[in-house]
C-alpha cells in the first residue's frame, strides 16, 4: 500500500488552531510537476457533506512529502470530509478523514467501519442533544433510511446493513429531521472486496494474517498497519510517537501522538495513534490495553508486562505476542519484513535461526508464494545462530508476494513470512529533450516518463554521431538535473538515448528510444571594422567595412548591420547575405537622426563579435519642392527654367539644385547648383541642338529637399554640338531680353 497518512489535530478548543497534515513516505512524493510524481493534494471534499461557503483554506507545503491545511475560522468549517491524494500512476491513493462536530445532535460511536464483503455492518449514532423527530440516514448524500425517534435503543440510533458489498462503501450520516446537517453524525463505511482473510481478483488468495489490528488489502494482500506498527504483518511496534510504514515519521509536539487522528489508505480508515483512544484521541489506554484506539488486549504470559504502545514486553527467555514462546523453541531471527529485487535477477536470501537444539542447514527452508520449497546452498554456523543462504532462481513477476522462512527442530518450529517485491527496471517511454545547442555542446533534459518501477537512482545518457558504428559515449547523471554533452563536433547530428536504473542489482532498464540532436555551426570569430560611410541623402547611408585576413576559408554566411537610434530606443537590422560583400546601402532611415552603427559576421544563427561602433548623424530632411517648374527653349543651345519658391519653408534656402538629363539617355544626370536662392529663373546653356531634355529641381536649407515635378523641353534646331550645359540665373522681374 502507498505510505500515506492524513493527520487531524483534534485539540478543538479553537478552530483556528485546527490543522490537517498529509504526510507521504513514498520516494519522490509530492515533488510536483516533474516526471517523478504528481504533488500531494489535500482538500475539503464538499460533494457529499456540504457546508456554507467560508474564507478559503490555506495550504502550506513543508518539503516534498508533507502538506498542511489551515485557516479554519469557525467550527462549522471543520465538519465534513477531507481527502489527501498521493502516490503516482496506478499507486495514486486517496486517504479520507471524516470530521464530526463535537456539539452535534448525534455523534458516531465509531466513525470508521471496515467490514468484509458479505458482513453485516452496524452504524451507531449516539444521541447527544435529543430531538423528538425523525432521524434520516443518508448514504453518500442521498436519502437511505428513516427511523422514528422512538426507535432509539439505549440512546442510540442503529443502522443495520446486512450482507454489505463494496458499492455500499461511502459516507453515511444520521440527521434529525429538523436539524442542520452540520449537527449530523457522519460515518465512513469501507467494505473490503473479499470475505474475511482473503484477497485477490477472485478472492482466492489468503491474507498473511495481519497482527495488531492491521487490515489486509483486498487488492494486493498487503497489511495496512495501524499507526505505530510496521512489518509485513504489522508484527513490530514502532517507538512511542512514531508512525509511517517504516516508523520514519514523528508525531509533532511534546505530547507525542495525543490528540491526533490518523487516517491511512483503505481499507484501514482512521483511528487514534497507538496508545490513545476517545473521540478526540486524548485518553491513554486503560491498563491491559494497547495499540491504536486501545483496541488490543495484552494478555501477557510468563511475567510479561503490558506497554500501551507496543503490547507485551517479555522477560528474558520468552518471546511471542503474549510472551507465550520459550526461547528454547527455534526462532527465526531478524528477518526483514520486506525485500525488494529486480526482475530476472538471481538474488541470495539469508535466513537466520536460533534455538535449542541448534538449527542446522537442512532444518531451514524457504518457501516461495507458489509453494516451491528452496533448500539452502550453504549455512554459516555461529555460537548464537545458524544463517542459511538460499540461491534464488531467476526472478519473474509472479514471484512477488509472501515468502516464508521455516525452521524445524525437535524443539519445535517457527516460521516468518516476508514480502518479496519483484520490481521491473524502468524503461523510458520517450526520447530525451534538447534544451539548448551550441557548436560543440548540447544541453539535454533526461527527465522522461517511463514504464516499470521507480525510484530512479541513475540516468545514463548514451550518444554518438548519427549513422556512426563507433562505440556509444555514456554519461551518468543525477536524475533531477539537465545534462551538458561536451566536446562534440559542430554541425553534426547525434543520436541520443536514455537508460534509467533503479536501486539494486539488475536495476538497469533497457535503453529508451533514440532522438536526433544536431550541434550548431561553429561561431564566427572574425571581428569586422568599419572602413567608412557617407550620407547619400537625408534617409540614405552607404557603409563599407573590412575583415582581417586569415588563412583558410571564411567561416560566415553574411553580415548583420545594426543601427541604433538611441533617442527613440529603436534598432534597425540589415542583413547582407553574402560573406564577400564589403559595402551596403542603407535606405529608409530617419533624417536628422543620430545613429550608432556596427557590423558583425554571422554563421547559421550565430553572431560573431561586433565591430567597434561608429556614430553617424544624418542631415535633417530638406524643404518642400519648388512649385510650378516650367521650361522654355530660347535657342538651339539654351533653355530657360522658371519656378516659384516652395511654400512653408522651415528656414532660408541656401541654394537650388537643378537636375538635367537627356530624355531616354542612359548616362548619369547632371546636377547644377543655383547659388542665389532669391532667384526664380535660370538659363541652362551649352545644350545640344534639337535634343529633348528632362529637368527637375530641389531646394536646400540644411539638407536637400524634395524634388519638383519633372518638365520636358527640346532645344531649337541645327546648331553645333555644345560642350555641355551651363547655367545663368536672373531674377524673373529683369526679363530675358538679351
Amino acid at each position: 500500500a502507498v505510505d500515506l497518512t492524513l493527520l487531524a489535530n483534534l485539540r478543538l478548543t479553537d478552530p483556528q488552531r485546527f490543522f490537517l497534515t498529509c504526510v507521504s513516505g513514498e520516494a519522490g512524493a509530492g515533488r510536483g510537476s516533474d516526471a517523478w510524481g504528481p504533488p500531494l493534494l489535500l482538500e475539503k471534499d464538499d460533494r457529499i457533506v456540504r457546508t456554507p461557503p467560508g474564507p478559503p483554506l490555506r495550504l502550506a507545503r513543508n518539503g516534498s512529502h508533507q502538506v498542511t491545511l489551515r485557516g479554519f475560522s469557525k467550527p462549522s468549517d471543520l465538519v465534513g470530509v477531507f481527502s489527501c491524494v498521493g502516490g503516482a500512476g496506478a499507486r495514486r491513493t486517496r486517504v479520507i478523514y471524516v470530521h464530526n462536530s463535537p456539539g452535534a445532535h448525534l455523534l458516531p460511536d465509531k466513525v470508521t467501519h471496515t467490514v468484509n464483503k458479505g458482513d453485516t455492518a452496524v452504524l451507531s449514532a449516539r444521541v447527544h442533544k435529543e430531538k423528538q423527530t425523525d432521524v434520516i440516514w443518508k448514504s453518500n448524500g442521498s436519502y437511505f433510511y428513516t427511523l422514528d425517534w422512538h426507535e432509539a435503543q439505549d440512546g442510540r440510533f442503529l443502522l443495520q446493513l446486512p450482507n454489505v458489498q463494496p458499492p455500499s462503501s461511502g459516507i453515511y450520516s444520521a440527521t434529525y429531521l429538523e436539524a442542520s446537517p452540520l449537527g449530523s453524525a457522519f460515518f465512513r463505511l469501507i467494505v473490503r472486496g473479499c470475505g474475511a482473510g482473503r484477497w485477490g481478483p477472485g478472492c482466492t488468495k489468503e491474507c498473511p494474517g495481519c497482527l495488531h489490528g492491521g487490515v489486509c488489502h483486498d487488492h494486493d494482500g498487503e497489511c495496512v498497519c495501524p499507526p505505530g506498527f510496521t512489518g509485513t504483518r504489522c508484527e513490530q511496534a514502532c517507538r512511542e510517537g512514531r508512525f509511517g510504514q517504516s516508523c520514519q515519521e514523528q508525531c509533532p509536539g511534546i505530547s507525542g501522538c495525543r490528540g491526533l487522528t490518523f487516517c491511512l489508505p483503505d481499507p484501514y480508515g482512521c483511528s487514534c495513534g497507538s496508545g490513545w483512544r476517545g473521540s478526540q484521541c486524548q485518553e491513554a489506554c486503560a491498563p491491559g490495553h494497547f495499540g491504536a484506539d486501545c483496541r488490543l488486549q495484552c494478555q501477557c504470559q510468563n511475567g510479561g508486562t503490558c506497554d500501551r504502545f507496543s503490547g507485551c514486553v517479555c522477560p528474558s527467555g520468552w518471546h511471542g505476542v503474549h510472551c507465550e514462546k520459550s526461547d528454547r523453541i527455534p526462532q527465526i531471527l531478524n528477518m526483514a519484513s520486506e525485500l525488494e529485487f529486480n526482475l530476472e535477477t538471481m538474488p541470495r536470501i539469508n535466513c537466520a535461526a536460533a534455538g535449542n537444539p541448534f538449527p542446522v542447514r537442512g532444518s531451514i527452508e524457504l518457501r516461495k508464494p507458489d509453494g516451491t520449497v528452496l533448500l539452502s546452498t550453504k549455512a554459516i554456523v555461529e555460537p548464537e545462530k545458524t544463517t542459511a543462504e538460499f540461491e534464488v532462481p531467476r526472478l519473474v513477476l509472479a514471484d512477488s508476494g509472501f515468502w516464508e522462512c521455516r525452521v524445524s527442530t525437535s524443539g519445535g518450529q517457527d516460521s516468518r513470512r516476508f514480502k518479496v517485491n519483484v520490481k521491473v527496471p524502468p524503461v523510458p517511454l520517450a526520447a530525451p529533450r534538447l534544451l539548448t545547442k551550441q557548436s560543440r555542446q548540447l544541453v539535454v533534459s533526461p527527465l522522461v516518463s517511463f514504464s516499470g518501477d521507480g525510484p530512479i537512482s541513475t540516468v545514463r545518457l548514451h550518444y554518438r554521431p548519427q549513422d556512426s558504428t563507433m562505440d556509444w559515449s555514456t554519461i551518468v547523471v543525477d536524475p533531477s538535473e539537465n545534462v551538458t554533452l561536451m566536446n562534440l563536433r559542430p554541425k553534426t547530428g547525434y543520436s541520443v538515448r536514455v537508460q534509467l536504473s533503479r536501486p539494486g542489482e539488475g536495476g538497469e532498464g533497457a535503453w529508451g528510444p533514440p532522438t536526433l540532436m544536431t550541434t550548431d555551426c561553429p561561431e564566427p570569430l572574425l571581428q569586422p571594422w568599419l572602413e567608412g560611410w557617407h550620407v547619400e541623402g537625408t534617409d540614405r547611408l552607404r557603409v563599407s567595412w573590412s575583415l582581417p585576413l586569415v588563412p583558410g576559408p571564411l567561416v560566415g554566411d553574411g553580415f548583420l548591420l545594426r543601427l541604433w537610434d538611441g533617442t527613440r530606443g529603436q534598432e534597425r537590422r540589415e542583413n547582407v547575405s553574402s560573406p564577400q560583400a564589403r559595402t551596403a546601402l542603407l535606405t529608409g532611415l530617419t533624417p536628422g537622426t543620430h545613429y550608432q552603427l556596427d557590423v558583425q559576421l554571422y554563421h547559421c544563427t550565430l553572431l560573431g563579435p561586433a565591430s567597434p561602433p561608429a556614430h553617424v548623424l544624418l542631415p535633417p530632411s530638406g524643404p518642400p519642392a519648388p512649385r510650378h517648374l516650367h521650361a522654355q527653349a530660347l535657342s538651339d543651345s539654351e533653355i530657360q527654367l522658371t519656378w516659384k519658391h516652395p511654400e512653408a519653408l522651415p528656414g532660408p534656402i541656401s541654394k537650388y539644385v537643378v537636375e538635367v538629363q537627356v530624355a531616354g539617355g542612359a548616362g548619369d544626370p547632371l546636377w547644377i547648383d543655383v547659388d542665389r536662392p532669391e532667384e526664380t529663373s535660370t538659363i541652362i546653356r551649352g545644350l545640344n541642338a534639337s535634343t529633348r531634355y528632362l529637368f527637375r529641381m530641389r531646394a536646400s536649407i540644411q539638407g536637400l529637399g524634395d524634388w519638383s515635378n519633372t518638365v520636358e523641353e527640346s532645344t531649337l534646331g541645327n546648331g553645333l554640338q555644345a560642350e555641355g550645359p551651363v547655367q545663368e540665373s536672373r531674377a524673373a522681374e529683369e526679363g530675358l531680353d538679351q
Epitope: I136, T146, L147, H150, E151, E178
Partner: antibody, heavy 127, light 102 residues
Framework: EVQLLESGGGLVQPGGSLRLSCAAS????????MGWVRQAPGKGLEWVSW????????TYADSVKGRFTISRDNSKNTLYLQMNSLRAEDTAVYYC????????????????????WGQGTLVTVSS | DIQMTQSPGTLSLSPGERATLSCRAS???????LAWYQQKPGQAPRLLIY???SRATGIPDRFSGSGSGTDFTLTISRLEPEDFAVYYC?????????FGQG
C-alpha cells in the same frame, strides 16, 4: 421505474372491515417511510397514517385512530391498511404514497415530500 | 392541529397568464416542511414543490414556490393548457400532516 399499486377497495357496510394492500416496485421499499392519504368524493386530500421503514413506528390521524392499522411486509414489498368499524365518512379513494426526504440547499434542514403515489383504490361504506 | 387555508378557492385564468396561489398556516411552519401538489381529475396528486421553494424532479421552471412562517405562495409564471388543475399545499412540520382544501 417506481410503481405503487393499491388493491382491496370495494363496497362494505357500516361497521364492516376491509384490508387495503399497496404493492411497491422499482425502489428499495424497506428503506422508505410509507403512508396512506384519502380523498372523499369531490373533497380535498386527508392524511390517514404512516409507517416507518422498520415497521416499528406508526402514526394515525385522529379520525381513524383505534380503528385502522397500518403495517408492512418488507420481504414482499407491500404496505397494508386494515380498516375496521368502517363508517360512511370513511368513503374515499385511498392512495398509498412514498415519503422521500430532500436536501434542498445542502446547508439547511432536510425537506420531506410525498414523491410517488399509487393510482388509488375506492372504498365505499354504505348500507 | 395546524390548519392550512388556500386562497382563492377558484382562479379563472387563460393560457399564457400568470397564476398566484396562496396558502396560509394557522401557526408558523418551517419552510423546509411545506410542499405543493397538483391533481388533475381522475389522477393521483403529483409533488411539485418541496421545502417551500425547491422544484421536484421533472417539474418545469415556470412553477416556483416562496414564503416562510405562515404565508406561502405557488406561482405559475405563464400558464400552459396542462396546468389547469387543483393545487394543494401541505405541511409536515407537526403531526398530523395537513393539506389545504385545494
Amino acid at each position: 421505474e417506481v410503481q405503487l399499486l393499491e388493491s382491496g377497495g370495494g363496497l362494505v357496510q357500516p361497521g364492516g372491515s376491509l384490508r387495503l394492500s399497496c404493492a411497491a416496485s422499482g425502489f428499495t421499499f424497506s428503506s422508505y417511510k410509507m403512508g396512506w392519504v384519502r380523498q372523499a368524493p369531490g373533497k380535498g386530500l386527508e392524511w390517514v397514517s404512516w409507517i416507518y421503514p422498520s415497521g416499528g413506528g406508526t402514526t394515525y390521524a385522529d379520525s381513524v385512530k383505534g380503528r385502522f392499522t397500518i403495517s408492512r411486509d418488507n420481504s414482499k414489498n407491500t404496505l397494508y391498511l386494515q380498516m375496521n368499524s368502517l363508517r360512511a365518512e370513511d368513503t374515499a379513494v385511498y392512495y398509498c404514497a412514498r415519503v422521500n426526504y430532500y436536501d434542498s440547499s445542502g446547508y439547511g434542514p432536510i425537506a420531506p415530500g410525498l414523491d410517488y403515489w399509487g393510482q388509488g383504490t375506492l372504498v365505499t361504506v354504505s348500507s | 392541529d395546524i390548519q392550512m387555508t388556500q386562497s382563492p378557492g377558484t382562479l379563472s385564468l387563460s393560457p399564457g397568464e400568470r397564476a398566484t396561489l396562496s396558502c396560509r398556516a394557522s401557526q408558523s411552519v418551517s419552510s423546509s416542511y411545506l410542499a405543493w401538489y397538483q391533481q388533475k381529475p381522475g389522477q393521483a396528486p403529483r409533488l411539485l414543490i418541496y421545502g417551500a421553494s425547491s422544484r421536484a424532479t421533472g417539474i418545469p421552471d415556470r412553477f416556483s414556490g416562496s414564503g416562510s412562517g405562515t404565508d406561502f405562495t405557488l406561482t405559475i409564471s405563464r400558464l400552459e393548457p396542462e396546468d389547469f388543475a387543483v393545487y394543494y399545499c401541505q405541511q409536515y412540520g407537526s403531526s398530523p400532516w395537513t393539506f389545504g382544501q385545494g
